[in-house]
Every structure is written in C-alpha cells, then in structure tokens.
Interface confidence: low
C-alpha cells in the first residue's frame, strides 16, 4: 500500500513512525508523463516489499515537502531510514528503483 502525503507534518510523522524500516518516497506530479508511467510499478513494489514503507508526494499539493527535500525534477525517489536520507535519484528508472530498495532494505 502507498500512503499519500498531504502535509509536511504528515511527512515527518510517517518518517518517524517507520522506525527501522526503509521508507521510499515518490515525488511526482499529475502533469508528469514519466511519473504516470512508473506509478503502477511503484504501487506493485509496495505490495512486493511489505516490510518497506511507500509514500507518495504530489509536488503541487505539497510544495513545502518538495521544497524541504530539495526536489528539482519529477519523478524523484528518496529513501529514508531512521529519519535520515540514505539515498536519492531522479527519473523513471524501474530497475534502479527496485535495485536501490534491495540495496537499502
């Protein structure tokens, strides 16, 4: 399951609540073609990796979170553990997304 993040507080709360678990954040936008393309894959990964927390941030609805996380382009994937960013990349690269999850989980 992918959790939609609606505010900065909700974002920080989700990171905090994750404990030791890996958190994967998808920063996307409704007008972004590559974001739409990778979205089903991102959701399928959330089913496959049940021990990982998957979050989705719409950069237009949540500009403060996107700004705080210094998101410059979409899609951007950021990875957090224990509240710390442990990885990041931009682009709709399915292989890299799953490889990074496997590397960090």
């Amino acid at each position: 399951m992918v959790k939609q993040i609606e505010s900065k507080t909700a974002f920080q709360e989700a990171l905090d609540a994750a404990g030791d678990k890996l958190v994967v954040v998808d920063f996307s936008a409704t007008w972004c073609g590559p974001c739409k393309m990778i979205k089903p894959f991102f959701h399928s990964l959330s089913e496959k990796y049940s021990n990982v927390i998957f979050l989705e941030v719409d950069v237009d609805d949540c500009q403060d979170v996107a700004s705080e996380c210094e998101v410059k382009c979409m899609p951007t994937f950021q990875f957090f553990k224990k509240g710390q960013k442990v990885g990041e990349f931009s682009g709709a690269n399915k292989e890299k997304l799953e490889a990074t999850i496997n590397e960090l989980v």
């Epitope: 709360e13 710390q84 960013k85």
Partner: antibody
C-alpha cells in the same frame, strides 16, 4: 522570513522550575517539528527533544526524560520548554530550533538559564 | 544512541593553511551535518548531507565521509573561519559531537 524569538534570561533557585518560550514567525509551527537543544557554558550541544505541534507528540533524549517537558500552543505559534527540579547542572543556554532535512535550519537566539 | 567523537578538540591554523577535522560515529550513519558556532551566537548549519554547503558558506569548505568516518576540510584557512565546529547526526535520536575549536594562529 522565518524567525524564532525566545524568551529572556532566567535566574532561578535550585529545586524550582522554569518555562521557556519560543515564538515562531514566517511559518506555521503545525507544519514541522520544533526541537530544543541545551548548551552548558563552554560546552557542546545536547539535543533535548522535539514536539510535533500539530498533535502534541513529543520525543526526548532519555537523558532529559523527567527533566524536560516540551509543549506547544498553535494559536500563538509558540513552543515551550519546561525544566523541573533545577540544579546547577541545568545552568545553560537553551535553543529552540527548526531542524530540517535538507532545507535551511533555523535557530532561536537562545535563552540563558542560571540556577543559583 | 549514536555517539559522535570529534578530533581534535582544539586546533590552531595560520591564514592560508589547510585544515581538516574529523568526526567518528559509534554506528554507521548515512549523512553527517556540520554546524559552525561563534561565541555568543546560535549555531549555524554549515554542511548538510555530508558534503553539501549551506547557503552562504564559502567554497573553501568541504565535507566528506561515509559509514562511521566523516570530515570537514577548509582548503585555505581565513581569519573568519575561527569558530567551534560541531558534527551532528539525524537518527531517531539526534546527537552532536563535543566540537572542534578552531583558533587562528
């Protein structure tokens, strides 16, 4: 412009309590976490804890559990730090801080507490 | 809790000299933060995400490291760099190092 304005210096007696305030401007404290940091004279920085003002959830360094109580009032956009059963070890400057992940951090000017 | 050990505790450098200070973590961390503090002032974020310079920080500063070993380097010391530098990690329970006091020789 983001600013954190802290209350003035305190001189308190051993065994007493003190409540420090930190009023934010330029942002809504409900949208973030507010942290408190202690710095004893000529010493380093110690993280005390933080609050999520949106729901009142707090987290403390175990060392400060029972000593410090962090609260917030969203109507006045203010976070508070209460210190109880004060001793000379509590003589320090206390900072409120907005510690963000990658964006700029913001710190208050500090409040000096002297226990004497 | 992660303990951060900074060395040296105090050091002095002449203008133009290269300066390196280190911060060792008791457990692996993913990113290190560094703060600069001058007497009577609040700490200032100096370096974040291990190697990114905060806004307004001169390019002579750099940060590096991974795992448990991190460092802050000044390529050519200037008088205004004299200050105390603290390393900081952002796990579930944030901690700071004891600081390195950099004096002008």
């Amino acid at each position: 412009e983001v600013q954190l304005q802290q209350s003035g210096a305190e001189l308190v007696k051993p065994g007493a309590s003190v409540k420090l305030s930190c009023t934010a401007s330029g942002f809504n404290i409900k949208d973030t976490f507010m942290h408190w940091v202690k710095q004893r004279p000529e010493q380093g920085l110690e993280w005390i804890g933080r609050i999520d003002p949106a729901n009142g959830n707090t987290k403390y360094d175990p060392k400060f559990q029972g000593k410090a109580t962090i609260t917030a009032d969203t109507s006045s956009n203010t976070a508070y730090l209460q210190l109880s059963s004060l001793t000379s070890e509590d003589t320090a400057v206390y900072y409120c801080a907005l510690l963000q992940y990658s964006a700029m951090d913001y710190w208050g000017q500090g409040t000096s507490v002297t226990v004497s | 809790q992660i303990v951060l050990t900074q060395s040296p505790a105090i050091m002095s450098a002449s203008p133009g000299e290269k300066v390196t200070m280190t911060c060792s973590a008791s457990s692996r961390i993913s990113y290190m933060y560094w703060y600069q503090q001058k007497p009577g002032t609040s700490p200032k974020r100096w370096i974040y995400d291990t190697s990114k310079l905060a806004s307004g920080v001169p390019a002579r500063f750099s940060g590096s490291g991974s795992g448990t070993s991190y460092s802050l380097t000044i390529s050519t010391m200037e008088a205004e760099d004299a200050a105390t530098y603290y390393c900081h990690q952002r796990s579930s329970y944030p901690t700071f190092g004891a600081g390195t006091k950099l004096e002008l020789k």
